[in-house]
C-alpha cells in the first residue's frame, strides 16, 4: 500500500489512513450529489467481498468523463495490487447486473464503513 | 460527438414481440460495449442487457433473461434488442447507451407499451 502515499502526506500511508481518505471521500460524493451522479451511468455490481478493491475499480474505471469519481478511481488503484484498465474483469466476479454509479457508490461506502468499524483496513 | 438514436417502440399486447433498433455515430461503435437500460413511468433507471463489443458476451437482467435477445452489427454500427413474451411490466422508454457514459449521450428513446 506504499503507492498511497501522495494523498495526504508525502510518505507512505498506514492502511487505516487510506481507508478512511477513502470513505471520505465517497461521503463527500454522495453529499454533494445534486444531478445524477455521472449522468446515470451504469456499472456492474460487485461482489463486496475478497478482491473488492479490484473489482470496484474494474467496474468504475469503465465509467469516462466524469470528474466525480476521478479522484475515487485513483484511491482504487491504490488498494489494487494489479493495473486495471478499461474493459478489464476479472473471472471472479459474475456479470450479473448493473447499477447506477449513485448507488454503486452507496453501496460500497456502507460496506467500507464497516470495514472500518471492525478494523480490517487491507 | 457521440450519437444515439433509438426505435422500434410502440403499442403491443402481452406476450407479442418487439424489435428495437440503436443507429450509433460518432464513435468507434465496434470498440465498446453496448447497453440497453430502461426507465419506466415513475420509476429510476434500469438495467436491461449489455453486450461485449464483438458480440460474443451478452448479459441479461433477471427480469428479461429467456425472453430478450441483446444483438449488434458492427458493420451497421447499430444496436438491436429482440423482445419476446412481453409484459405490462416491460412498459417503459428504452434507451441504448454507450458503456460507462450516461444519459447525456443517450438518444430521445423509444416508448414500448404492453398493454391489451
Known amino acids: 500500500l506504499t503507492c498511497l502515499g501522495g494523498f495526504a502526506s508525502p510518505g507512505p500511508v498506514p492502511p487505516s489512513t487510506a481507508l478512511r481518505e477513502l470513505i471520505e471521500e465517497l461521503v463527500n460524493i454522495t453529499q454533494n450529489q445534486k444531478a445524477p451522479l455521472c449522468n446515470g451511468s451504469m456499472v456492474w455490481s460487485i461482489n463486496l467481498t475478497a478482491g473488492m478493491y479490484c473489482a470496484a475499480l474494474e467496474s468504475l474505471i469503465n465509467v469516462s468523463g466524469c470528474s466525480a469519481i476521478e479522484k475515487t478511481q485513483r484511491m482504487l488503484s491504490g488498494f489494487c495490487p494489479h493495473k486495471v484498465s478499461a474493459g478489464q474483469f476479472s473471472s471472479l466476479h459474475v456479470r450479473d447486473t448493473k447499477i447506477e454509479v449513485a448507488q454503486f457508490v452507496k453501496d460500497l461506502l456502507l460496506h467500507l464503513k464497516k470495514l472500518f468499524r471492525e478494523g480490517q483496513f487491507n | 460527438e457521440v450519437q444515439l438514436l433509438e426505435s422500434g417502440g410502440g403499442l403491443v399486447q402481452p406476450g407479442g414481440s418487439l424489435r428495437l433498433s440503436c443507429a450509433a455515430s460518432?464513435?468507434?461503435?465496434?470498440?465498446?460495449?453496448m447497453d440497453w437500460v430502461r426507465q419506466a413511468p415513475g420509476k429510476g433507471l434500469e438495467w436491461v442487457s449489455t453486450?461485449?463489443?464483438?458480440?460474443?458476451?451478452?448479459y441479461y437482467a433477471d427480469s428479461v433473461k429467456g425472453r430478450f435477445t441483446i444483438s449488434r452489427d458492427n458493420s451497421k454500427n447499430t444496436l438491436y434488442l429482440q423482445m419476446n413474451s412481453l409484459r405490462a411490466e416491460d412498459t417503459a422508454v428504452y434507451y441504448c447507451?454507450?458503456?460507462?457514459?450516461?444519459?447525456?449521450?443517450w438518444g430521445q428513446g423509444t416508448l414500448v407499451t404492453v398493454s391489451s
Open positions: 460518432g464513435f468507434t461503435f465496434a470498440g465498446y460495449s
Open positions: 453486450i461485449s463489443p464483438r458480440g460474443g458476451g451478452t
Open positions: 447507451a454507450k458503456e460507462g457514459t450516461g444519459f447525456a449521450y
